[in-house]
Amino acid sequence: MSKGEELFTGVVPILVELDGDVNGHKFSVSGEGEGDATYGKLTLKFICTTGKLPVPWPTLVTTFSYGVQCFSRYPDHMKQHDFFKSAMPEGYVQERTIFFKDDGNYKTRAEVKFEGDTLVNRIELKGIDFKEDGNILGHKLEYNYNSHNVYIMADKQKNGIKVNFKIRHNIEDGSVQLADHYQQNTPIGDGPVLLPDNHYLSTQSALSKDPNEKRDHMVLLEFVTAAGITHGMDELYK
């Protein structure tokens, strides 16, 4: 078990803070909740603290919760491939470019680390080149989320990882908006981290609303499990 992994044996409080600017529309989001890495479970609620969110909530899911991939459940035989937990408590910097097909792009930079006993994800997001009447600024996305696989590979030069995946957002007219994600994670501290073999995270996310909440918000329940690496030969012969 890595030192960082020991921090994830129970339920951990989570705080998320985002400052965003998309085509000049500035906004802030605060989120709170809990993560349980034993089950790969995340429960989070987000509030737009500046009024109405200028972009659809589903376009921010990867920035919020795929940001705290340290809560992914890594099966016993894959624990030596868990970069995310191994970087804790000092944490990691997570940078992404998200290209929305036939529309603009988000660039995000986040620091994910422990502050006391709370896992904090602080994010800056900049969005450019979006069409004012497109699927994103025109709010044409459905309020739901599909399952995805998130592909991870080691980046030995940077002592971190590179991550690629393609999100499929459902559009109200029945079509799909693709969002290509290019991600890089580097540790904040200078302690040893686990550099993984190629594998993937299988994610399932459910979006809901709090019927009593008057503020613009999103409630998110997510399960994430690592997969894609089989047991070694020694395991097969036990």
Epitope: V11, P13, E32
Partner: nanobody
Framework: DVQLVESGGGLVQAGGSLRLSCTAS????????IGWFRQAPGKEREFVGI????????YYADSVKGRFTISRDNAKNTVYLQMNSVKPADAAVYSC??????????????????RGQGTQVTV
């Protein structure tokens, strides 16, 4: 569902006692600082008290200190507000909130992301 639900409100005589409950569903209540707030008609919402996560540390507003007690039962995923020696000035809608934030932010209702709907206390 991820929500907080208050219960236990009602009519109480001056000098009497009442116990309010704040029960969480979809959340692990021991993970959060749980604050109690109240709002009387025509008045500002005010901080009543808070119980800090991972323990029994509590803080109270001066107006209720020595009379109100906050406790938690993690097995029932519930936090209680025990109100003793109730005064007419205690009449209000009482609501609870859950936050992972500490310090001054935990005394500000607006900084709470998880909030209950409230329960009426009449004296």
């Amino acid at each position: 569902d991820v929500q907080l639900v208050e219960s236990g409100g009602g009519l109480v005589q001056a000098g009497g006692s009442l116990r309010l409950s704040c029960t969480a569903s979809g959340l692990t209540i021991s993970t959060y600082n749980i604050g109690w707030f109240r709002q009387a008609p025509g008045k500002e919402r005010e901080f009543v008290g808070i119980i800090i996560r991972n323990g029994d540390t509590t803080y109270y507003a001066d107006s209720v200190k020595g009379r109100f007690t906050i406790s938690r039962d993690n097995a029932k995923n519930t936090v209680y507000l025990q109100m003793n020696s109730v005064k007419p000035a205690d009449a209000a809608v009482y609501s609870c909130g859950a936050t992972v934030r500490a310090g001054a932010a935990a005394e500000q209702y607006n900084s709470y992301i998880f909030r209950g709907q409230g329960t009426q206390v009449t004296v």
